[in-house]
Amino acid sequence: AIVFIKQPSSQDALQGRRALLRCEVEAPGPVHVYWLLDGAPVQDTERRFAQGSSLSFAAVDRLQDSGTFQCVARDDVTGEEARSANASFNIKWIEAGPVVLKHPASEAEIQPQTQVTLRCHIDGHPRPTYQWFRDGTPLSDGQSNHTVSSKERNLTLRPAGPEHSGLYSCCAHSAFGQACSSQNFTLSIADESFARVVLAPQDVVVARYEEAMFHCQFSAQPPPSLQWLFEDETPITNRSRPPHLRRATVFANGSLLLTQVRPRNAGIYRCIGQGQRGPPIILEATLHLAEIEDMPLFEPRVFTAGSEERVTCLPPKGLPEPSVWWEHAGVRLPTHGRVYQKGHELVLANIAESDAGVYTCHAANLAGQRRQDVNITVATVPSWLKKPQDSQLEEGKPGYLDCLTQATPKPTVVWYRNQMLISEDSRFEVFKNGTLRINSVEVYDGTWYRCMSSTPAGSIEAQARVQVLEKLKFTPPPQPQQCMEFDKEATVPCSATGREKPTIKWERADGSSLPEWVTDNAGTLHFARVTRDDAGNYTCIASNGPQGQIRAHVQLTVAVFITFKVEPERTTVYQGHTALLQCEAQGDPKPLIQWKGKDRILDPTKLGPRMHIFQNGSLVIHDVAPEDSGRYTCIAGNSCNIKHTEAPLYVVDKPVPEESEGPGSPPPYKMIQTHHHHHH
């Protein structure tokens, strides 16, 4: 049964931030995992995609990610399907909106002493709390004839008088963040002597070295005064400009012009209007310098014909917010069509081969333009140029099987031999074009071969049978030198294979016939009792009709096999004394004797003064030391055979005689009688 180890759980998420719905599955067989949103399968996009079994969100979207997500695991073999618990996001967001007049119905109906209600159209989840401002100053509830209903996001002025005139804005904040009104409301209740806003400066974003204009106008009777201030309260006039505002001009209508704007000019500008009576009106506007960052690189994409795919272009950070559009072959992608742009996404529906190519995402604002290319390849199913053919390959020679296909992208070719994947090694090689080379064909290469050519769009396969044309050869080739033991029975085998079963016969190299006690039985040369005369050169001949004949020459030697006359014994010697290890062997040809001590051959030419090997084969070690202890092996060998025998050598300290021991008391173990070696 399919078991969910980790289930997706409902969670809080922030608009535009990352999120992950976890899902982990355990099942006896392979399962494929997919996700549902409100019962419909979730398609991968760059914004929302499967990450293993889990669903990853690069940027949560309150519209596209609202609903119920479910992780589904399906065993395609059994058809068993398991669904996880439902999970959804509690998406926190905030979105700016305007300040609008709720009551009365139109501005024309606003009169002194009437009730005025303004509504703040900032929305969000969780519901934000609202703060109202008049001319940039926060308004607190219950002061100066106004009430703030946070729940209704309304500001009510009752009754409204000239002192309430001004620019009303609102801000709202919640767990997600903060937003301020996108469009403010100017309330004008006439008291002719009060300064009244006619035109309020707006925040501006300009490119470096461009010009910026702030408009500001007040009206009153008599006319009000107007003054501009920058950031640090520095007044700006045409007579006294601060050093960093040399290129500022204040016009008679109150507008402020800044030319060749530089970074140091960015900041808050205040326009202050003062009537004969009433408070000064301070209006603020910010000058921002336009900027645009670089765009991240796109990975090349491979899509399948007939599918629907999307590529998201995340706009670079910039001010103002850069606009984004996609182009292909120099033409903007349309809003509708089989290939279209929607929001920041390039969408290719029912992909065709002709859709392949370079698509460019452009982003632009006042600061400039950025672009990034994405290379889209439309994968096609491979087609055959040359299928593998049933083939007869010669043993011992290289063999080739073709598998030539074409597709986009270039297909990958794998070969199977008897349903087992062929991994490239010293015998097999797959060329770039898909051809399989068998470097040296062997008999057991005669079997079924299958090649599979694949792209992301699909795969094709074909198989072929290989028949190996066997060489005429000895199996195995007879040893060229062989020994037979004198006066014993002996056999010398010779076998061969070929395309047809070969006939095998032996003959003496000099052409003379085999003696009667020697028989040739289906390739096996049999000596009933080996004599000295049986030594010599013999030839094994294998032949068949189509392939002719082959010959193997064997030199037979008659020998008396080695036996040991004297073998070394287990020996214990006192330190500093001499050890003698005896060894004598006999045989024909006369054997040579070698010694091996402590796992290495003792080379007679490099033994040094302490060791010596006698003519008869015995080994003598003078002035023995503890490190001479160990196994010593006597190896006797001739051209026909080799034999060895071994014995241990123990080197011990000479005991100090005790009172109780008589001078003739025997040692506690068998000692070899040796002479003490005196140093001079």
Partner: antibody
């Protein structure tokens, strides 16, 4: 078959808000690729595109009217609503809703239109 | 915004004639153009999309061509029922914009 029908007031006063409803059948706005446009045509004049809402609630507005327009959908009722604030006599026109199929073309099926007159 | 300039504003032709209406875009719109027919007192009907694709059920005498900035609607073998105003629409970018229309009269 696909049908669309516009409904709303035939007469509105200047400064008032116009609310128009497009009720459709023969397709669903929950189907991927479906959208509804609003288009208007003043008497004897050319067509003017106003707004578009897609199946996934993606909305597009004509920038020249953006501050006055709001488009919403009620998928379960097969309805799309357009509201236009601060109406003016120059807004007198026949208002059409039309279906868009994102993979084909904008406005492949249209309603018969509703004439809205703005007058005091 | 992309401007669509349609010409002529009106034309008169006889049954059986071949009629050509053109639309010029203020910038490259690829093939993102549709043509609509609006009979008197009726809603517009889609004729051509993607500059040259005839919409389902539209008679073969209507054909569209062009790409980039210059587009043409051709009516061959004019019929009495073709009396209507014809509009082009670009959908390369938002806002979608229409041509001013061409009023076609039958002599």
């Amino acid at each position: 078959q696909v049908t669309l029908k516009e409904s709303g007031p035939t007469l509105v006063k200047p400064t008032q808000t116009l609310t128009l409803t497009c009720t459709f059948s023969g397709f669903s706005l929950s189907t991927s690729g479906m959208g509804i446009n609003w288009i208007r045509q003043p008497p004897g004049k050319a067509l003017e595109w106003l707004a578009l809402i897609w199946w996934d609630d993606d909305k597009y507005y004509n920038p020249s009217l953006k501050n006055r327009l709001t488009i919403t959908k009620d998928t379960s009722k097969n309805q799309v609503v357009l509201t236009m604030t601060n109406m003016d006599p120059v807004d007198t026109a026949t208002y059409y809703c039309a279906r868009s199929l994102i993979t084909t073309a904008p406005s492949d099926y249209w309603g018969q239109g509703t004439l809205v007159t703005v007058s005091s | 915004d992309i401007q669509m300039t349609q010409s002529p504003s009106s034309l008169s032709a006889s049954v059986g004639d071949r009629v050509t209406i053109t639309c010029k875009a203020s910038q490259n719109v690829g093939t993102a153009i549709t043509w609509y027919q609006q009979r008197p007192g009726k809603a517009p009907k889609l004729l051509i999309y993607s500059a040259s694709n005839r919409y389902t059920g539209v008679p073969s005498r209507f054909s569209g061509s062009g790409s980039g900035t210059d587009f043409t609607l051709t009516i061959s073998n004019l019929q009495p029922e073709d009396l209507a105003t014809y509009f082009c629409l670009q959908y390369s970018d938002y806002p979608l914009t229409f041509g001013q229309g061409t009023r076609l009269e039958i002599k």
